[in-house]
């Protein structure tokens, strides 16, 4: 007996071939001997089976002795043995219909779990293997679970169902809802405008939800809500914003915030959360602001940074085109009695300059100039 595997919702074509290459009488029946379809001369006739409107054939093939049975919009319960009667012969085809569905929505938040459930006909014992977009293989029986979804799990999951040495392939598109970056850091000189961007790692037709940016300034004892906003069909509207700092927010995606001035009192860490409509849980992105200030007071040239810097970052003070006068893994460095000239304050990581502030030291009889 020939075995054919089908997918729920798909179309399957069961073949039946006569030895004579001409249109002769044929009938397709199910295992209960109920007629599905057949022919009367060159016309198609249908029986009283439950397949009625979903069964068809290709009349253009009858002249060649081919009498296919096409079943569209397959259901699990269509799994059966189908019999083609032609030329006093009976050809039997066993059809097994499988369905593979994601337990919940296919749009899942980063860190959530994905469960794939296999629907199969009674008496079948299939095995399932799924391959994620990043090439990770998972195997299972009726259910497969993947916990802690990551951004790289977004994309097409290809699942192969094996039964009777035959296989059928399912493709399921999974969208992991997350920000493109889990964390970002912005380095600015005091007084500069600060731009924070929170690009999403997915695109959907309609995006609705609400968000908030909480900020923990390094100098503050507790965190503070800087801004709350709504998102309606990708349009951003501000609900509430603090007076200090007075943040501005872009009206379109990607989410974009502007801080008019980088000041030491704003240096710190923020957490932007986005709650999407009809989703449990929130998307998070951490953002950090490091602010640098270079000053000269009397005979002391000082360079300071505020905000979350890693211990391996180096803060240096150097006269332009000269070796660093002072270089420390600290948040403040100074030079006493600095020579006249253009001094550079540099924050660097393994030789790569992250932030630079210049200050002009004038001969001792005049005041310093900050470009």
């Amino acid at each position: 007996k020939k075995v054919v595997l089908g997918k729920k919702g798909d179309t399957v074509e069961l073949t039946c071939t006569a030895s004579q290459k001409k249109s002769i009488q044929f009938h397709w029946k199910n295992s209960n001997q109920i007629k599905i379809l057949g022919n009367q001369g060159s016309f198609l006739t249908k029986g009283p089976s439950k397949l009625n409107d979903r069964a068809d054939s290709r009349r253009s093939l009858w002249d060649q002795g081919n009498f296919p049975l096409i079943i569209k919009n397959l259901k699990i319960e269509d799994s059966d043995t189908y019999i083609c009667e032609v030329e006093d012969q009976k050809e039997e085809v066993q059809l097994l219909v499988f369905g593979l569905t994601a337990n919940s929505d296919t749009h899942l938040l980063q860190g959530q779990s994905l469960t794939l459930t296999l629907e199969s006909p009674p008496g079948s014992s299939p095995s399932v293997q799924c391959r994620s977009p990043r090439g990770k293989n998972i195997q299972g029986g009726k259910t497969l679970s993947v916990s802690q979804l990551e951004l790289q799990d977004s994309g097409t999951w290809t699942c192969t169902v094996l039964q009777n040495q035959k296989k059928v392939e399912f493709k399921i598109d999974i969208v992991v809802l997350a920000f493109q970056k889990a964390s970002s850091i912005v380095y600015k000189k005091e007084g500069e405008q600060v731009e924070f961007s929170f690009p999403l790692a997915f695109t959907v037709e309609k995006l609705t939800g609400s968000g908030e940016l909480w900020w923990q300034a390094e100098r503050a004892s507790s965190s503070k809500s800087w801004i709350t906003f709504d998102l309606k069909n990708k349009e951003v509207s501000v609900k509430r914003v603090t007076q200090d700092p007075k943040l501005q927010m872009g009206k379109k995606l990607p989410l974009h915030l502007t801080l008019p001035q980088a000041l030491p009192q704003y240096a710190g860490s923020g957490n932007l959360t986005l709650a999407l409509e009809a989703k449990t849980g929130k998307l998070h992105q951490e953002v950090n602001l490091v602010v640098m200030r270079a000053t000269q007071l009397q005979k002391n040239l000082t360079c300071e940074v505020w905000g979350p810097t890693s211990p391996k970052l180096m803060l240096s003070l150097k006269l332009e085109n000269k070796e660093a006068k002072v270089s420390k893994r600290e948040k403040a460095v100074w030079v006493l009695n600095p020579e006249a000239g253009m001094w550079q304050c540099l924050l660097s990581d393994s030789g790569q300059v992250l932030l630079e502030s210049n200050i002009k030291v004038l001969p001792t009889w005049s005041t310093p100039v900050q470009p």
Epitope: S42, S57, R58, R59, S60
Partner: antibody, heavy 120, light 107 residues
């Protein structure tokens, strides 16, 4: 002899409606699935709808789904295409075509076509 | 949807020439391909269906072959009445799609 004659084409404004007809003769109309196929100027042929022999099933591509409706009157041996919310890109010669038999069969006979122009 | 890529888009040939037109499907179409001849002001005419089955009344100089994704229409000896545009059609599923056409012109 199988004959298919389309009518109802013409000039219509964007957003407007038009109903095409196809008169069939020379065969038992009620035994065949029927279709409409169009060809826009300089473009390839495009199948736009199909209907089973007794109107049980109708089929459309996404490009016209919800805007076009295919129907038939087996007593009058006539096939229809109701086109609503017409767009400039619907400008084409519309052909009525007989299926070899069922919905899954190719077209074996075609009419000469009727021109539909959507323009303001 | 299944895409059909037909080549060449046009060709110039002389009476008596052997002409080959190919169609490639974006996926396996299980031999469900038909070929049509189209002349200006007329409806297309079915030449071949199911890859190689010649429609009654079509001259034997027309033949079709292929399998899987690749199919060919061959005119063994071009006749004056064969100058026309030829189209392939896939009917593997209900969303029928045509090739872009091949215009066969007189050299």
């Amino acid at each position: 002899e199988v004959q298919l004659v389309e009518s109802g084409g013409g000039l219509v404004q964007p957003g407007g409606s038009l109903r095409l007809s196809c008169a069939a003769s020379g065969f038992t109309f009620s035994n065949y699935a029927m279709s409409w196929v169009r060809q826009a100027p300089g473009k390839r042929l495009e199948w736009v709808s199909a209907i089973s022999d007794h109107s049980t099933n109708t089929y459309y591509p996404d490009s016209v789904k919800g805007r076009f409706t295919i129907s038939r009157d087996n007593a009058k041996n006539t096939l229809y295409l109701q086109m609503n919310s017409l767009r400039a890109e619907d400008t084409a010669v519309y052909y009525c075509a007989r299926k070899y038999g069922g919905a899954y069969d190719p077209f074996d006979y075609w009419g000469q076509g009727t021109l539909v122009t959507v323009s303001s | 949807d299944i895409q059909m890529t037909q080549s060449p888009s046009s060709l110039s040939a002389s009476v008596g020439d052997r002409v080959t037109i190919t169609c490639q499907a974006s996926q396996d179409i299980n031999n469900y391909i038909a070929w049509y001849q189209h002349k200006p002001g007329k409806g297309p005419k079915l030449l071949i269906h199911y890859t190689s089955t010649l429609q009654p009344g079509i001259p034997s100089r027309f033949s079709g072959s292929g399998s899987g994704r690749d199919y060919t229409l061959t005119i063994s000896s071009l006749q004056p009445e064969d100058f026309a545009t030829y189209y392939c059609l896939q009917y593997d599923n209900l969303l029928f799609t045509f090739g872009g056409g091949t215009k066969v012109e007189i050299k």
